[in-house]
């Protein structure tokens, strides 16, 4: 099952071009920008999604304190280099030969340098903290109901096994979702927490990546959960390497 056979579309990625030219006339979908074939039964990697986005027309209770090594994606959008599996290449460069090293979610983890910059390996982001602030409601959400609904959402919509949702914290109006996935834990076929977090982020912003589905309608016991702010922190298996001048 790679794509919807009846009308040849990609349910998990609307930024694709699909045609029935696969083996035996099966529907096959390729990501915009890279032209890489994607598996439409699961989430597309963040690298291919970013590449597609850059190629598209422009109109198109106890809270966790992020550690000193937590990264926030301050650089925003760029046109990434992806490897043949669709993962981010460890070294990214722009058109002006400025280069930097990224982690597995594509967030810069070193100072910028020139073409001589070396990035020996793609460092895995093993812990993601999604920090949400919800709009005022009549009362606080029940913590266990919120936990259950968010776990259900990540399992059913983003195909992430709940064992990778380490915790859901709630201190009204702040919700924190902790995703954790060590290299040793991730089996073949498991959705990467970085990809799940990216799909969730785009859903929350009203920019769903899913084909022809309604946007995200998050409800806890029937009460709408409307998010007004999102901040995502990324923690890598190896701490990032920035010079002191960045910290001042």
């Amino acid at each position: 099952h790679t794509a919807a056979q009846d009308n040849c579309t990609c349910p998990t990625n609307k930024m694709t071009v699909c045609s029935p030219d696969g083996p035996g006339g099966r529907c096959q979908c390729r990501a915009l920008g890279s032209g890489m074939a994607v598996d439409c039964s699961t989430l597309t990697s963040k690298c291919l999604l970013l590449k597609a986005r850059m190629s598209a027309p422009k109109n198109a209770r106890t809270l966790v304190r992020p550690s000193e090594h937590a990264l926030v994606d301050n650089d925003g959008l760029y046109d990434p280099d992806c490897d043949p599996e669709g993962r981010f290449k460890a070294r990214q460069c722009n058109q002006t030969s400025v280069c930097w090293c990224v982690n597995s979610v594509g967030v810069r983890r070193t100072d910028k340098g020139d073409l001589s910059l070396r990035c020996d390996e793609l460092v895995r982001t093993h812990h993601i903290l999604i920090d949400l602030r919800h709009r005022p409601t009549a009362g606080a959400f029940n913590h266990s109901d919120l936990d259950a609904e968010l776990r259900r959402l990540f399992r059913e919509r983003y195909r992430l096994h709940p064992k990778f949702v380490a915790a859901v914290h709630y201190e009204q109006p702040t919700i924190q979702i902790e995703l954790r996935q060590n290299t040793s834990q991730k089996a073949a076929g498991d959705v990467d927490i970085g990809d799940a977090a990216y799909y969730f982020e785009r859903d929350i912003k009203g920019e769903s990546l899913f084909q022809g589905r309604g946007g995200l309608d998050l409800r806890v016991r029937g009460e709408p959960l409307q998010v007004e702010r999102t901040l995502i922190y990324y923690l890598d298996e190896i701490p990032p390497k920035f010079s002191m001048k960045r910290l001042t």
């Epitope: 099952h1 349910p11 039964s41 259950a148 059913e156 709940p162 064992k163």
Partner: antibody
Framework: QVQLVQSGAEVKKPGASVKVSCKAS????????INWVRQAPGQGLEWMGV????????SYNQKFKGRVTMTTDTSTSTAYMELRSLRSDDTAVYYC????????????WGQGTMVTVSS | DIVMTQSPDSLAVSLGERATINCRVS??????????MHWYQQKPGQPPKLLIY???NLESGVPDRFSGSGSGTDFTLTISSLQAEDVAVYYC?????????FGQGTKLEIK
């Protein structure tokens, strides 16, 4: 209230196929995946696989791969499990069970469908 | 596959007494403090019924004489004061890893 109602008992010959249905009500069908579990007479429970009602694709227990197909019809909120090349040791009660909210527990079960394989 | 071993296979307890069923798992089902272990009750001619999820959480509507404990590889289901309606077969189940597996079952009877 949440209900899973399964189709009636079946008697099949060895080598034949059987298709069991599971009609859901009382909740949004596409919000929860459906699992299939079987129980041979006097024996324990055996997980066969799970189908995503949202995406329509399934993950099967390796033991049944190639013989089982799980499908859904969202227009009628019904899940189906088809088992092919039946053998006498496939005689069992077949249950559908819904995933619970947070931890992949099975919170609601169908009443079961008895499938007897006999020549 | 993860193997679940329940003990004992059968158990006879007097009404009002405590009943304890154990489940040992071949590998840990703990993920960041969340144990993907559940307990079900099955009465003759009926489907299983969820009692406990995530090792120790009581399912809605289940009497509080039922409780679950344990983590990692060793888990326990306890009925604090046995009632006549508790006569059934009890199963543990892991949902940490596909294929999901069940224990062989423990038959609980009244002494």
């Amino acid at each position: 209230q949440v209900q899973l109602v399964q189709s009636g008992a079946e008697v099949k010959k060895p080598g034949a196929s059987v298709k069991v249905s599971c009609k859901a009500s009382g909740y949004t069908f596409t919000d929860y995946s459906i699992n299939w579990v079987r129980q041979a007479p006097g024996q324990g429970l055996e997980w066969m696989g799970v189908i995503s009602t949202y995406y329509g694709d399934a993950s099967y227990n390796q033991k049944f791969k190639g013989r089982v197909t799980m499908t859904t019809d969202t227009s009628t909120s019904t899940a189906y499990m088809e088992l092919r090349s039946l053998r006498s040791d496939d005689t069992a009660v077949y249950y559908c069970a819904r995933y619970g909210d947070g931890y992949n527990q099975f919170d609601y079960w169908g009443q079961g469908t008895m499938v007897t394989v006999s020549s | 596959d993860i193997v679940m071993t329940q003990s004992p296979d059968s158990l006879a307890v007097s009404l009002g007494e405590r009943a304890t069923i154990n489940c040992r798992v071949s590998e840990s089902v703990d993920s960041y403090g969340n144990n993907f272990m559940h307990w079900y009750q099955q009465k003759p001619g009926q489907p299983p019924k969820l009692l406990i999820y995530r090792a120790s959480n009581l399912e809605s509507g289940v009497p509080d004489r039922f409780s679950g404990s344990g983590s990692g590889t060793d888990f326990t289901l306890t009925i604090s004061s046995l009632q006549a309606e508790d006569v059934a077969v009890y199963y543990c189940q892991q949902s940490y890893e596909d294929p999901y597996t069940f224990g062989q079952g423990t038959k609980l009877e009244i002494k």
